[in-house]
Interface confidence: low
Amino acid sequence: SIPWNLERITPPRYRADEYQPPDGGSLVEVYLLDTSIQSDHREIEGRVMVTDFENVPEEDGTRFHRQASKCDSHGTHLAGVVSGRDAGVAKGASMRSLRVLNCQGKGTVSGTLIGLEFIRKSQLVQPVGPLVVLLPLAGGYSRVLNAACQRLARAGVVLVTAAGNFRDDACLYSPASAPEVITVGATNAQDQPVTLGTLGTNFGRCVDLFAPGEDIIGASSDCSTCFVSQSGTSQAAAHVAGIAAMMLSAEPELTLAELRQRLIHFSAKDVINEAWFPEDQRVLTPNLVAALPPSTHGAGWQLFCRTVWSAHSGPTRMATAVARCAPDEELLSCSSFSRSGKRRGERMEAQGGKLVCRAHNAFGGEGVYAIARCCLLPQANCSVHTAPPAEASMGTRVHCHQQGHVLTGCSSHWEVEDLGTHKPPVLRPRGQPNQCVGHREASIHASCCHAPGLECKVKEHGIPAPQEQVTVACEEGWTLTGCSALPGTSHVLGAYAVDNTCVVRSRDVSTTGSTSEGAVTAVAICCRSRHLAQASQELQGSTSGSGLNDIFEAQKIEWHEHHHHHH
Amino acid sequence: QEDEDGDYEELVLALRSEEDGLAEAPEHGTTATFHRCAKDPWRLPGTYVVVLKEETHLSQSERTARRLQAQAARRGYLTKILHVFHGLLPGFLVKMSGDLLELALKLPHVDYIEEDSSVFAQ
């Protein structure tokens, strides 16, 4: 009875409820850069203001007939998905539309840039509350479009974009590849990636999360009361723009980094069938489907972290890959991964006043990835402590020696091409939890942080026999900040965090043989912030109203005679 | 945007007297780069976004655009400034022949130039 997409983004315990009040997302303005729209459609009438901005190329073909309903189709549907009276996510959000796509759904990078500039100027002339910009479009990789998105994001605007419908790496497209933009892929009612004809949703490390994007019911421009089903990553992005509007309306002071972390945190985890993605993209693609938070407050105490993958280093011997966190996130740990297993580890290093995570390829390697663990840790003071390769056979050790600093991550980097099988003791000496241990020929880097109320602990899971994957997870209430492998020997492909689980991958068992060299331990560093928890309790004590759990409650809907239309 | 074609001849005449050496030369050792869409059918040659260095003021953007027009006119090329950017990125959008790219890349304040390309509803 309820459209599957609205049910999917609703927190489970609210599914029984029937209603969502008319002002969910009401403190937020959502800008839509798309086709023209039918602003008098009953779904969006009075909710969408059509600006006078228009910058579109001529339609192709001499026989093209401009038909209003076709010209308005894409934008009208998306406006309905974001804020439609019946089928919208954020029914209270106000929208403003800019026309950057023509009647064939085609625009230009330059027209989009001028549109983004128009939004920035409007924001300066008349500052309002939080702004969300929805970009349900994609072109080839564009340095200038990505740069414009970065500037607008740094001005406090939340940009949400479609990952693209090319069944390809989203990093090859813009604005999907802009790191500051929230990039959304599309899934269907079965939580599978959406197939669109011979193509489908884009994927890869530039996608932040997925959202419903197939058979989405929304306003049709065929008539002022018509509805239609459309599919695509635009529809998925519109869901996330709506969810963002709901979150920002409940917490208007949220920064882009905080919003992105919350979107990731409240997503459904590990429900997408990754077999649909190309094998080399599976590890890079987030297995997350967007959902609304169950309530406004209570999220504040959480230590939020996300995993950021670098671009591939390429195969040259000295190639490196760099993963960076957003400006107001802290890099709490750094790891690396190589499919061939040939790598020379990773290290945290300062770049432009911020820590970055750099991974090093090795001779004969096909390339490496750097994996950064990026966290929201207010008032944090983090530094990296390094120990050079040890002379002794015991292995290299480094610990956080400053008062009040705790260990959040361990990295190791080596210059030798192959660490060989010499392995240090896997277990740390008791009473020294703030210590990183590594191979004697590797330099070890400890990420040490001081932040109010921050506490961390090390959790290990060792497998004596060879195994392709070893995992260790942090328990409820703790957040994974660091993920590494012991020992750092050559058969370990690398380590990376997936949500709250540390994954260590090793070479195929058949190639390793079941020697003692197959023993691998996954080491997770789990942290929590007592300070954030306390601040959140104080906030809840002084806040009346029950927030999003009142604002977003699913609707019971009965469907009749809707058409199907794919974009 | 208003159509500037009508004012074009007058503008060119006014700029012809400007000598190349009068304005600042590009900083030593920094070379502006040219970018274009990797997907050939999506390219829109003939329209270019000239992106200037981060701290460039609007007046400098306008001056750089006029300078490009003057130098192009001297070589017998017609150019049209479609938009001057400020607020997000400093720069301008210009309709011109690809033959002028080398010249444009040498202009002062230029960070990079990108050929316009198509975007599509998803």
């Epitope: 009875s1 029937e18 209603y19 009040p21 008319p22 002002d23 009401s26 403190l27 009953r42 009438e45 009075g46 909710r47 009276r85 019946d86 089928a87 209270g92 106000s94 009361t225 018509c226 509805f227 109203g545 009142d550 609707q555 019971k556 809907i557 009965e558 469907w559 009749h560 005679e561 | -």
Partner: antibody
Framework: QVQLVQSGAEVKKPGASVKVSCKAS????????MHWVRQAPGQGLEWMGY????????KYHQNFKDRVTMTRDTSISTAYMELSRLTSDDTAVYYC??????????????WGQGTTVTVSS | DIQMTQSPSSLSASVGDRVTITCKSS????????????LAWYQQKPGKAPKLLIY???TRESGVPSRFSGSGSGTDFTLTISSLQPEDFATYYC????????FGQGTKLEIK
């Protein structure tokens, strides 16, 4: 003029179902949501739910959601409310009322004359 | 669910009297985007369907006499009849439409 004309009184046995119709005239049926409100003898008004004729969306009050079904036939501008598994507590006058489908117009400006449903063994 | 509490539940008055009925909601009915209070007042006479008097807390429906006025914002609302006429003796209901729809229990206005 604008009118909502409801079907006649019904007498039903406990456990049975009743289907009340509401025919609209004098305005564009699709432009207004149709609500159903009931009033037990000597009691106040109780909102049951609504249907948006243009999309077919329905929203039901928690108390009725397992027993009520609201439908519409746009070709004859008529809305229907069916209530199943009737008990004597369902004895009431059932009203349909229209609400303009617009953000700020969340009020019922035209009502039907009411349909009396009596549930008795 | 939002609760609506009307008071008094009944009252006796004479023609020409000024009458005030109050309605309290369990949460604010002010829509933050439209800046309107989603509260309406209805009049019902025996054997008849309810009739809309006031919407958005204070806007009179067309055709409703000016002696009827509504006021209030947030959680506290008032319906005032400035000078009672014989045809005004009826039951009055307030109704919230901020989250779902809930009616007050009604106020019966009788002739003294």
């Amino acid at each position: 003029q604008v009118q909502l004309v409801q079907s006649g009184a019904e007498v039903k046995k406990p456990g049975a179902s009743v289907k009340v119709s509401c025919k609209a005239s004098g305005y564009t049926f699709n432009d207004y949501w149709m609500h159903w409100v009931r009033q037990a003898p000597g009691q106040g008004l109780e909102w049951m739910g609504y249907i948006n004729p243009s999309s077919g969306f329905t929203k039901y009050h928690q108390n009725f959601k397992d027993r009520v079904t609201m439908t519409r036939d746009t070709s004859i501008s008529t809305a229907y409310m069916e209530l199943s598994r009737l008990t004597s507590d369902d004895t009431a006058v059932y009203y349909c009322a229209r609400q303009y489908d617009y953000d700020e117009d969340w009020y019922f400006d035209v009502w039907g004359q009411g349909t009396t449903v009596t549930v008795s063994s | 669910d939002i609760q609506m509490t009307q008071s008094p539940s009944s009252l006796s008055a004479s023609v020409g009297d000024r009458v005030t009925i109050t309605c309290k909601s369990s949460q604010s009915l002010l829509n933050s985007r439209t800046r309107k209070n989603f509260l309406a007042w209805y009049q019902q006479k025996p054997g008849k369907a309810p009739k809309l008097l006031i919407y958005w807390a204070s806007t009179r429906e067309s055709g409703v006499p000016s002696r009827f006025s509504g006021s209030g914002s947030g959680t506290d609302f008032t319906l005032t009849i400035s000078s009672l006429q014989p045809e005004d003796f009826a039951t009055y209901y307030c109704k919230q439409s901020f989250n779902l729809f809930t009616f007050g229990q009604g106020t019966k206005l009788e002739i003294k």
